[in-house]
């Protein structure tokens, strides 16, 4: 139901009076205040913004808003002694070099302290050899070149196109792989949208254009240097030989101007099919090498890029609850951005200020939330999610008995098409809800509601009338609340049409073309679906913090579970014959996801029964609904992920942006047929599936009657 | 074949005006910028303007701004620069030229006309 | 604006000859540096974009090489057609700017 209930109010001060009070132009504003110059992590211009918001959050009338800070590590060009990768010929000459820098965007020419492209947290190196062209470099592309092609990665340096996966995962193949070096492209073929113009004339990536971004394999650590704890000023820090998820290659990247120049002249085997071909005017050739006449040639990587440790800022604004002052619920998104940050991170940003600025005018006219909300503007998001963890790191102990939610604000758009949302199943009838109430910006929906738009546009493959909701993955701030705390998390936002746009994220992500007029001229001119984002993020941080029972619907949990079980099973029994010969039953998983649907149909039962005007009643069924996400927490985590804790929900194994359902089962039967000891894989897998059904038998337990 | 045909040069008196044009063929007119470089007698080229028929954005030297006015007719495939108050300095063959993109440098060249600013 | 230093002025060379003109920009321009020849009466003809890339038709004994600011247009061996004006021209920010051009002359 809605929430009309907070306290010391007059009626008026509801959802609605909420919702209206977010402005469409109070988001542009924002968005053009903070993608004026760059917001790069660790520089002077974020410790600015960072004590911007800090001001502006108090004026809009937050209880108290603070700066927490951390010296992490961070990865930074050599101003002197830039990255880039050439060609040589036989004497060593350098006959073809990339690009040093993009060039400006209009009006951005005399801007300073443009970060150039880099892949940070490389490490140093000149490596020279033959190139390699190892597709996404996606494990399935490692498996068609070793296994199928025959071809040895060793001592190459490979080139990969960006996008499918997080560009970390391509980079720890290629290292498993044996590659010295690696050079990330982005190909037209996944980052320009056929019959749209390049950046300035259209929203499509130039050919001098680059996707920086971070190489880390952190696995939910934070700061390298300091995993499980905060890095504050008694911490005690690793040598960089121990820290977490550094890579051990040199890594750059290039656009694809640059990349035909090194794809042309590609010999060595064909590609495999055509899954392989991008759109550039080269033949794809694997290699490895140079073709004929230039076989002599060489490839030669110049990297010089350092690691620091690095004073970081978070903002962390409170607005206390009235009633329950001890449950939070937490709205936060990051503020660093590589260069201007047009969309990433500053149309979430943007979005968050705007959902303080009416929080805080409602707060103003003498309301208060029923339970506590944080605001937050992390730090070092785009660095390996550092600044978020590290304070979860250091509050654990408060989220893990307080955190009812976490709700992410990072880029409000990717594109203009529907909506997309991300989160527990916890929130799956909150999202449907509450999108059954807002108006739909879309053209051709005019008066008709988001959820119908949505629902045409993004239908879920499972369930008709009923949009498309996916897992949470990883590559963003939630990680650490909802994959090493185990607090409920959603996240929304504006996308494109994934049918006929196939290309990976947008085409400008990460590059400097990344401005403000890129989102005003070309994404969202009046600012509707920054609005749209702006209602359904604060809408569910309203309706998180306001209502009296939590919108959280654990039959909806129940749901995904049975469907995640069939999915799992179905997988192992891809291999029967084992099977049969090492006894794998899923009998006992199958046997917790019935009783969980059991005990959660009559939880829910209770739940619309019980004496709400009874304050200790109320607080313990919450309790219940609170703590279920947190009941899927393994405190050993999964094997060799400590910090992913989730049994049910995972980042892939094989890219840190996707979600895996019952990770530890799926990566033990990952390829199992092809390990060396069939006994001990497939034993694995059986402890596994013990694992898993003991978590969800135990979490079907928190919601049973207490006595 | 790319062809760009310059024409409407001449003598002008000092102060007046002229429109040259640029009339393009063998392309895709939309697809490309065009560009205006001047080259006064015995003198090195000097980049004035660039339009974008795409979205009819302007970009001018310092030297012609508020002076020069780019524009074209999309219905013709032809650029025009139109130059007012001109001065001796503004004599020079003009060149119409294109570039596949904001950041690319220009592939075909008109073969130039010439302007004469004289009393 | 971004200056760009064209040297020599005047190069006087024989056929056969390896001829090398230098362009230094004011400040750095990545790669984004063109080269183009000019003959009398006639209008620029680009020979390489992007510092390195050679323009489809032109004879490979033109070279370029360079990033940053100091950027060298090679002619590996000197023929006749050769003799001609070049000028360097940067194309990574408005305004366009060019050196201020070359004369390859008959030794």
């Known amino acids: 139901k809605s929430s009309n209930e907070a306290t010391n109010i007059t009626p008026k001060h509801n959802m609605k009076a909420f919702l209206d009070e977010l402005k469409a132009e109070n988001i542009k504003k924002f968005l053009y205040n903070f993608t004026q110059i760059p917001h790069l992590a660790g520089t002077e211009q974020n410790f600015q913004l960072a004590k911007q918001i800090q001001s502006q959050w108090k004026e809009f009338g937050l209880d108290s808003v603070e700066l927490a800070h951390y010296d992490v590590l961070l990865s930074y060009p050599n101003k002197t002694h830039p990255n880039y990768i050439s060609i040589i010929n036989e004497d060593g000459n350098e006959i073809f070099n990339t690009s040093l820098f993009e060039p400006p965007p209009p009006g951005y020419e005399n801007v300073s302290d443009i970060v150039p492209p880099f892949s940070a947290f490389s490490p140093q190196g000149m490596p020279e050899g033959d190139l390699v062209y190892v597709n996404y470099a996606r494990t399935e592309d490692f498996f068609k070149l070793e296994r199928d092609m025959k071809i040895n990665c060793s001592g190459k340096i490979v080139i990969a196109r960006y996008g499918k996966v997080f560009r970390g995962n391509k980079v720890k193949n290629a290292q498993l792989a044996g590659a010295k070096g690696v050079i990330l492209y982005s190909d037209p073929a996944d980052y320009f949208a056929p019959g749209v113009k390049s950046y300035p004339d259209g929203w499509n990536l130039p050919g001098g254009g680059v996707q920086r971004g971070n190489i880390l394999n952190l696995n939910g650590a934070g700061d390298p240097l300091t995993p499980g704890y905060p890095a504050n000023e008694y911490a005690y820090r690793r040598g960089i030989a121990e820290a977490v998820g550094l890579p051990s290659i040199p890594v750059h990247p290039i656009g694809y101007y640059d990349a035909q120049k090194l794809l042309e002249k590609m010999g060595g085997s064909a590609p495999p099919d055509s899954s392989w071909r991008g759109s550039l005017k080269v033949p794809y050739n694997v290699g490895p090498g140079f073709t004929g006449n230039f076989s002599t040639q060489k490839v030669k990587m110049h990297i010089h890029s350092t690691n620091e440790v690095t004073r970081i800022y978070n903002v962390i604004g409170t607005l206390r609850g009235a009633v329950e002052p001890d449950r939070y619920v937490i709205l936060g998104g990051h503020r660093d951005s590589w260069v201007f940050g047009g969309i990433d991170p500053q149309s979430g940003a943007a979005v968050v200020h705007e959902i303080v600025r009416s929080f805080g005018t409602l707060k103003k006219e003498g309301w208060r939330p029923r339970r506590t909300i944080l605001f937050a503007s992390w730090d070092a998001e785009e660095f390996g999610l550092l600044g978020s963890t590290e304070w979860a790191e250091e509050n654990s102990r408060l989220l893990q008995e307080r955190g009812v939610a976490y709700i992410n604000a990072d880029s409000s758009i990717e594109g203009n098409y529907t909506l997309r949302v991300d989160c527990t199943p916890l929130m799956y009838s909150l999202v449907h809800n509450l999108t059954k109430e807002l108006k739909s910006p879309d053209e051709g929906f005019e008066g008709k509601s988001l959820y119908e738009s949505w629902t045409k546009k993004s239908p879920s493959p499972e369930f008709s009338g009923m949009p498309r909701i996916s897992k949470l993955g990883s590559g963003n701030d939630f990680e650490v609340f909802f994959q090493r705390l185990g607090i409920a998390s959603g996240r929304a936002r504006y996308t494109k049409n994934w049918e006929t746009n196939k290309f990976s994220g947008y085409p400008l992500y990460h590059s400097v073309y990344e401005t403000y007029e890129l989102v005003e001229k070309f994404y969202d001119p009046m600012f509707k679906y920054h609005l749209t984002v702006a209602q359904v993020r604060g809408g569910m941080v309203f309706e998180l913090a306001n209502s009296i029972v939590l919108p959280f619907d654990c039959r909806d949990y129940a749901v995904v579970l049975r469907k995640y079980a069939d999915k799992i099973y179905s997988i192992s029994m891809k291999h029967p014959q084992e099977m049969k010969t090492y006894s794998v039953s899923f009998d006992s998983l199958f046997s917790a996801v019935k009783n969980f649907t059991e005990i959660a149909s009559k939880f829910s039962e209770r739940l619309q029964d019980f004496d709400k005007s009874n304050p200790i009643v109320l607080r313990m069924m919450n309790d219940q609904l609170m703590f279920l996400e947190r009941a899927f927490i393994d405190p050993l985590g999964l094997p060799d992920r400590p910090f992913y804790r989730h049994v049910i929900y995972a980042p892939s194994s094989h890219n840190k942006y996707a979600g895996e359902s019952f990770p530890g089962i799926y990566d033990a039967l990952f390829d199992i047929e092809s390990k060396v000891d069939p006994s001990k894989a497939w034993g694995e897998v059986k402890r596994q599936i013990y694992v898993a059904a003991f978590t969800v038998q135990a979490a079907a337990e928190t919601l049973s009657e207490v006595a | 074949e790319v062809q760009l045909l310059e024409s409407g040069g001449g003598l002008v008196q000092p102060g007046g005006s002229l429109r040259l044009s640029c009339a393009a063929s063998?392309?895709?007119?939309?697809?490309?910028?065009i560009h205006w470089v001047r080259q006064a007698p015995g003198k090195g080229l000097e980049w004035i303007g660039s339009?974008?028929?795409?979205?009819?954005?302007?970009s001018y030297a310092d030297s012609v701004k508020g002076r020069a006015t780019l524009s074209v007719d999309k219905s013709k495939n032809t650029a025009y620069l139109q130059m007012n108050s001109l001065r001796a300095e503004d004599t020079a063959v003009y060149y119409c030229a294109r570039s596949d993109g904001y950041y690319d440098a220009m592939d075909y060249w008109g073969q130039g006309t010439l302007v004469t600013v004289s009393s | 604006d971004v200056q760009i230093t064209q040297s020599p002025s005047t190069l006087s060379a024989s056929v056969g000859d390896r001829v090398t003109i230098t362009c230094r920009a004011s400040?750095?321009?990545?790669?984004?540096l063109a080269w183009y020849q000019q003959k009398p009466g006639k209008a620029p003809k680009l020979l390489i974009h992007s510092g390195s890339s050679l323009e489809s038709g032109v004879p490979s004994r033109f070279s370029g090489s360079g990033s940053g600011t100091e950027f060298t247009l090679t002619i590996s061996s000197l023929q006749p057609d050769d003799f001609a004006t070049y000028y360097c021209?940067?194309?990574?920010?408005?305004?366009?700017?060019f050196g201020q051009g070359t004369k390859v002359e008959i030794k």
């Open positions: 021209q940067q194309h990574i920010e408005y305004p366009w700017t």
């Open positions: 063998g392309y895709t007119f939309t697809d490309y910028y």
């Open positions: 400040k750095s321009i990545s790669k984004y």
């Open positions: 339009f974008n028929p795409y979205n009819d954005y302007t």
